[in-house]
Interface confidence: low
């Protein structure tokens, strides 16, 4: 979590002198409570916006907007604390709007916004706006929170952001998978314009089950420049196990910009249509427990064979 680097952060508007400050997320009013505190924000809205850094990099940012309630408590409003919590890491970042003049009622409702929190693709955040000073212990809460899910790099606008492009989002492998005779799968995909290696991760499952019955990894060496954007064809030999018929093929690139952590693409081959009275699937021993998320170290099993070639 960080702030977009280059802009002078502004919160002043006509009728209000205001400055944006870094915050420890622990406002002084927590420690030294005040008797009179403002009411909570109204209509908190979080939207996905995009902003460029001075270097020209494009980042997704959280656009935070809220309004004030039309009550007398705005006379005691000294500012606001904006907090963004990344839910999977518990990382929190805060900034503080410090009002340098007192708010007055005017015809239009007071509205505030801030668009400088950089967010990560595919991550979920909790955004909180706390009016300051914070309430006394057991006082009515004067904050509003909303969760905000950032789209992943598949999203059209996200795809061209710097974090997504450095994860390989512009590469579209256009994977095709076909079942051949003699327990084989033919995998074809488009190589990217970088001399880097790829891994194909094959995981097979029984019909309607999520425990793998076969796993295999195949390594594809780095293509030569004349092979960039060409199709690479790989034939994978499957385990001859009755009922082990649903195959997930995942292609993991190792682009220089993301190495172990590049975006993976996958395709799935479904089991053939089941007859009315399906044969019972024989017992099998899963090679290991189902995948619980893609490890940045690769998964594999020592069985199965494969070969490949680049197709011109």
């Amino acid at each position: 979590l960080r702030l977009l680097d280059h802009r002078a952060l502004v919160c002043s508007q006509p009728g209000l002198n205001c400055t944006v400050k870094n915050s420890t997320c622990l406002d002084d009013s927590w420690i030294h409570p005040r008797n009179l505190t403002p009411s909570s924000p109204k209509d908190l809205q979080i939207q996905l916006h995009f902003a460029h850094t001075q270097q020209g990099d494009l980042f997704p940012v959280a656009h935070i907007e809220w309004t004030l309630q039309t009550d007398a408590s705005i006379l005691y409003l000294e500012g606001a604390e904006l907090s963004v919590l990344q839910l999977n890491t518990n990382e929190r970042l805060c900034v503080k709007f410090q009002f340098l003049s007192m708010l007055q009622h005017h015809r239009k409702r007071w509205r505030f916004s801030f668009s400088h929190f950089v967010v990560d693709p595919g991550q979920e955040y909790e955004v909180t706006v706390h009016h300051l000073p914070k309430p006394i212990p057991d006082g009515d809460p004067n904050h509003q929170s909303k969760n905000f899910l950032v789209p992943d790099c598949e999203h059209a606008r996200m795809k061209v952001t710097t974090p997504c492009m450095s994860s390989g989002s512009l590469w579209d492998p256009n994977i095709t998978v076909e079942t051949l005779e003699a327990h084989q799968l033919r995998v074809s995909f488009t190589l990217w314009n970088e001399s880097t290696h790829y891994q194909i991760l094959l995981t097979s499952f029984p019909h309607m089950e999520n425990h793998s019955c076969f796993e295999h990894m195949h390594h594809i060496p780095a293509p030569r420049p004349e092979e960039f954007h060409q199709r690479s064809n790989v034939t994978l030999t499957l385990r001859n196990l009755k009922g082990c018929c649903r195959h997930q093929v995942q292609i993991q690139p190792f682009f220089s910009s993301c190495l172990n952590d590049c975006l993976r693409h996958s395709a799935t081959v479904s089991c053939p249509e089941m007859p009315d009275t399906p044969e019972p699937i024989p017992d099998y021993m899963p090679l290991w427990e189902p995948r619980s998320g893609s490890s940045d170290y690769k998964d594999d099993d020592d069985k199965g064979s494969s070969h490949h070639h680049h197709h011109h």
């Epitope: 172990n260 290991w288 893609s294 170290y297 099993d301």
Partner: antibody
Framework: EVQLVESGGGLVQPGGSLRLSCAAS????????MNWVRQAPGKGLEWVSF????????YYADSVKGRFTISRDNAKNSLYLQMNSLRDEDTAVYYC???????????WGQGTTVTVSS | DIQMTQSPSSLSASVGDRVTITCRAS??????LAWYQQKPGKFPELLIY???TLQSGVPSRFSGSGSGTDFTLTISSLQPEDVATYYC?????????FGPGTKVDIK
């Protein structure tokens, strides 16, 4: 020069907390997954925790699950290990280590010593 | 979880001897295995990855072999500077367990 430098070790009482840091330099830290590995006095290596480059994947050894938290700040080229509810058996030299594309860990820090004792 | 075992736990050999250390995984891990050397008071150093690929800068007297569950680290001609403890580590999926180590010294 590719370098990892750990800090934050020290003497702490059982039940106490420590935060270890690992400062990376000489490579694009934000592109690499990272690990913490520890070694108790006179014992072997024990893998402790893993975090992927964008913090999207995190793993812990069973022995530290629920007590230790791994995190990173790519803007600061830093890796962290927050250690709570420390026990005598957490006494060890703690190393941060960078995984190599293709496997294994090819860059290690010099280690920082954590002693848990009353 | 997959367990890693090493044998022997320690060995003494003469300079110039061929030394073999074995590492066994309780389940198949393909070639997702690394070998490390750790000298007393130092941090570990990667010797071999992908079971048999020599890490850059490592002397050619070190070699690795094996796939699936059984792996071997061989020092073709033991040198005084090879006195160390050697560890294997699996990295196919978490936990990324190390073997208990094999201590090598000179007779």
């Amino acid at each position: 020069e590719v370098q990892l430098v750990e800090s934050g070790g020290g003497l702490v009482q059982p039940g106490g907390s420590l935060r270890l840091s690992c400062a990376a330099s000489g490579f694009t830290f934000s592109s690499y997954s990272m690990n913490w590995v520890r070694q108790a006095p006179g014992k072997g290596l024990e893998w402790v925790s893993f975090i992927s480059a964008r913090s999207s994947t995190i793993y812990y050894a069973d022995s530290v699950k629920g007590r230790f938290t791994i995190s990173r700040d790519n803007a600061k080229n830093s890796l962290y290990l927050q250690m709570n509810s420390l026990r005598d058996e957490d006494t060890a030299v703690y190393y941060c280590a960078r995984p190599k594309v293709g496997g294994g860990m090819d860059v290690w820090g010099q280690g920082t010593t954590v002693t848990v004792s009353s | 979880d997959i367990q890693m075992t090493q044998s022997p736990s320690s060995l003494s050999a003469s300079v110039g001897d061929r030394v073999t250390i074995t590492c066994r995984a309780s389940q198949g891990i393909s070639n997702y295995l690394a070998w490390y050397q750790q000298k007393p008071g130092k941090f570990p150093e990667l010797l071999i990855y992908a079971a048999s690929t020599l890490q850059s800068g490592v002397p050619s007297r070190f070699s690795g072999s094996g796939s699936g569950t059984d792996f071997t680290l061989t020092i073709s001609s033991l040198q005084p500077e090879d006195v160390a403890t050697y560890y294997c580590q699996k990295y196919n999926r978490a936990p990324f367990t190390f073997g208990p180590g094999t201590k090598v010294d000179i007779k």
